[in-house]
């Protein structure tokens, strides 16, 4: 079957990084310089992407592949593929409208991305809290008085912080 | 191809006034927020304002508000930063960004950048 197709279709024989050259009856010419096909059989190679102003190349563009960008410092990456690139902010700030602000009393967020979340509620499990929330960390909750019996554990950590939502304001 | 082109830039004394232009073409312009950030000699970049897509919301970094003014002109395609009481440490590359599809909504992401334009403030 495959050498059938391909006595039907000569360009399914032409490699990743070449394209099937229909001006030159169709034979397989390599991709120009700055453009790539990544896979076999194309009739065209595609642009190249090009990582300008806050985007920086994490990977050149070769012939068989497209290139890479990432953010240049103080910026993050957002989006299939790093589309776009979003500002850092502090620990204890989020993105806002009006650009990084302080975490409000009672959040805390412990990256330079995303946005402020509420300490956790030690009380809700039956503890207490043993170290006081910051703006840029959670409590961390203690024993109630009920734990404290011999061999009992004496500290129990915040949930693992999930990456979170982005919220504007 | 989707592009944005800045320019307005220049020597100014301590106290003057500057207009940056941002051209923008190839995309649907009034669909995108627009920005402003710059970069001061040897520091990152630093968010200076941004105007949403119909130009109903401005918001500015604390250290511009009340000196520089941001709109933008949809039939022409551009947007403005009016830059009055200009001190020395404005002097910075000015660039102005387009905000992807959702921004403010869900993040505050830019796509598109321009080449910059050369701002300095001195006597």
């Known amino acids: 079957f495959e050498r059938t197709r391909s006595l039907q279709d000569p360009c399914s024989n032409c490699p990743a990084g070449t394209f099937c050259d229909n001006n030159r009856n169709q034979i397989c010419s390599p991709c120009p310089p700055n453009s790539f096909s990544s896979a076999g059989g194309q009739r065209t190679c595609d642009i190249c992407r090009q990582c300008k102003g806050v985007f920086r190349t994490r990977k050149e563009c070769s012939s068989t592949s497209n290139a890479e960008c990432d953010c240049t410092p103080g910026f993050h990456c957002l989006g299939a593929g790093c589309s776009m690139c979003e500002q850092d902010c502090k620990q204890g700030q989020e993105l806002t409208k009006k650009g990084c602000k302080d975490c409000c009393f009672g959040t805390f967020n412990d990256q330079k991305r995303g946005i402020c979340r509420p300490w956790t509620n030690c009380s809700l499990d039956g503890k207490s809290v043993l170290v006081n929330g910051t703006k840029e960390r959670d409590v961390v909750c203690g024993p109630s008085p009920a734990d404290l019996s011999p061999g009992a554990s004496s500290v129990t950590p915040p949930a693992p912080a999930r990456e979170p939502g982005h919220s504007p304001q | 191809e989707v592009q944005l082109v800045e320019s307005g830039g220049g020597l100014v004394q301590p106290g003057g006034s500057l207009r940056l232009s941002c051209a923008a073409s190839?995309?649907?312009?009034?669909?995108?927020?627009m920005t402003w950030f710059r970069q001061a000699p040897g520091k990152g970049l630093e968010w200076v304002a941004h105007?949403?897509?119909?130009?109903?919301?401005?918001y500015y970094e604390d250290s511009v508000k009340g000196r520089f003014t941001v709109s933008r002109d949809n039939a022409k395609n551009s947007v403005y930063l009016q830059m009055n009481s200009l001190r020395a440490e404005d002097t910075a590359v000015y660039y102005c960004?387009?905000?992807?599809?959702?921004?403010?909504?869900?993040?505050?992401?830019?796509?598109?950048w321009g080449q910059g334009t050369t701002v300095t403030v001195s006597s």
């Open positions: 105007i949403k897509e119909d130009g109903s919301e401005k």
């Open positions: 190839g995309f649907t312009f009034s669909s995108h927020w």
């Open positions: 960004a387009r905000g992807g599809d959702g921004y403010s909504d869900s993040h505050f992401g830019v796509d598109v």
